[in-house]
């Protein structure tokens, strides 16, 4: 014969536990219903009546089955350096992420506390490791035979063009200048086929970085000549 189905509230078997989407109410000493996401417990259960649930008010939410007396407040609106990637609904909190060109320099449980602008590599330096949502750009000096003439958070060091006749040799921040005959591009970033002095650089390849998490909010302007711009976010 099938086992009898117990309807909430009910007393659990000695040493037993309540079922999925139920909780044990210490006061009533009964297994009672949890409220679904988007709702909260308006009235707790008793020995004879089950939990009474009610919808979350505007700007509040519950994401899980619960028996909380009040819904959680959604986070404040996203700041100017952030975009809202998940709106505040009755079932989920607002999530703010850093806008394009920025990364999260200091995270919080959901979203980002501190956004900062991605580093721009200056001329002579190229991007060694691109920025991500949670890590800054890593720059490296352009190796002999390569150059970068831009200030950019995306440009890598590019090979110098190969000239039949070189008018001006290239360097780390400038491409080679050829005389009137049409130039070609070197395929390998390290290949140097032009009459350019090649210096010996013991550690030109920067150590390979490993993955990171950096997270972001802006409350301070940098002091001093010019590094990172930070943006601020509300919690």
């Amino acid at each position: 014969l099938p086992a009898q189905v117990a309807f909430t509230p009910y007393a659990p078997e000695p040493g037993g536990t309540c079922r999925l989407r139920e909780y044990y109410d210490q006061t009533a000493q009964m297994c009672c219903s949890k409220c679904p996401p988007g709702q909260h417990a308006k009235v707790f259960c008793t020995k004879t009546s089950d939990t009474v649930c009610d919808s979350c008010e505007d700007s509040t939410y519950t994401q899980l089955w619960n028996w909380v007396p009040e819904c959680l407040s959604c986070g404040s609106r996203c700041s100017s350096d952030q975009v809202e990637t998940q709106a505040c609904t009755r079932e989920q909190n607002r999530i703010c992420t850093c806008r394009p060109g920025w990364y999260c320099a200091l995270s919080k449980q959901e979203g980002c506390r501190l956004c900062a602008q991605l580093r721009k590599c200056r001329p002579g330096f190229g991007v060694a490791r691109p920025g991500t949502e949670t890590s800054d750009v890593v720059c490296k000096p352009c190796a002999p035979g390569t150059f970068s003439n831009t200030t950019s958070s995306t440009d890598i060091c590019r090979p110098h063009q190969i000239c039949h006749v070189v008018a001006i040799p290239g360097n780390a921040s400038m491409d080679a200048v050829c005389t009137s005959t049409s130039p070609t591009r070197s395929m390998a970033p390290g290949a140097v086929h032009l009459p350019q002095p090649v210096s010996t650089r013991s550690q030109h390849t920067q150590p390979t970085p490993a993955p990171s998490t950096a997270p972001g909010t802006s409350f301070l302007l940098p002091v001093g000549p010019s590094p990172p711009a930070e943006g601020s976010t509300g919690d």
Epitope: G124, D136, S226, P227, P228
Partner: antibody
């Protein structure tokens, strides 16, 4: 006001270990690259180690590579230098410095007051 | 490694003098060169960055020039508080070496 305060220096025997800390305040710590620079008594300045803002990229001078480890805790606004296999020639004042914002702003713009490390038997 | 040759190692000058310190690198560092001032018992202080740019709060009597491998720090009119040791440094490939320092003393 930007402040960098080093601690953890002291007297240690050759072959011993020491961990330096640098407590930072007055700026958004997690967005800045940081370094350690040292100065032996009566001598010039020597760059020791660098770590980028997210802690994913570290560089070392050849004199300390394999013995020293730079790290940071962005939640605690603290920079560290773990020094192992210490030698007499590591005796110096160790400065915690902000920068370089490498590849973009290449300089050390703020320095701590320094902490003295003496390696002697 | 890039070698930094700073000269002179020391100099004696009087208040009001024009002082010039030079720094030569073993290869081009593309103006990635700051200058620092250090007084006895104190931490260094940034004076000039990118070879020519004056750091915040630094008096205009300090100036920097140069490119490629040759760089110069000039103090146009030496003041009593300028007696100190000056260092250049490069930020090209690692290791980021400093010059040996120039001690500016009172004549």
């Amino acid at each position: 006001e930007v402040q960098l305060v080093e601690s953890g220096g002291g007297l240690v025997q050759p072959g011993g270990s020491l961990r330096l800390s640098c407590a930072a305040s007055g700026f958004a710590f997690s967005t800045y690259d940081l370094s350690w620079v040292r100065q032996a008594p009566g001598k010039g300045l020597e760059w020791v180690a660098y770590i980028n803002n997210g802690g994913i990229s570290t560089y070392y001078s050849d004199t300390v590579k394999g013995r020293f480890t730079i790290s940071r805790d962005n939640a605690k606004n603290t920079l560290y230098l773990q020094m192992n296999s210490l030698r007499a020639e590591d005796t110096a004042v160790y400065y915690c410095v902000r920068g370089p914002f490498y590849g973009s702003a290449n300089y050390f713009d703020y320095w701590g007051q320094g902490t003295l490390v003496t390696v002697s038997s | 490694d890039i070698q930094m040759t700073q000269s002179p190692s020391s100099l004696s000058a009087s208040v009001g003098d024009r002082v010039t310190i030079t720094c030569r690198t073993s290869e081009s560092i593309y103006s990635n060169l700051p200058w620092y001032q250090q007084k006895p018992g104190k931490a260094p202080k940034l004076l000039i960055y990118d070879a020519t740019k004056l750091a915040e709060g630094v008096p205009s009597r300090f100036s920097g020039s140069g490119s490629g491998t040759d760089y110069t720090l000039t103090i146009s009119s030496l003041q009593p508080e300028d007696f100190a040791t000056y260092y250049c440094q490069h930020f090209w490939v690692t290791p980021w070496t400093f010059g040996q320092g120039t001690k500016v003393e009172i004549k």
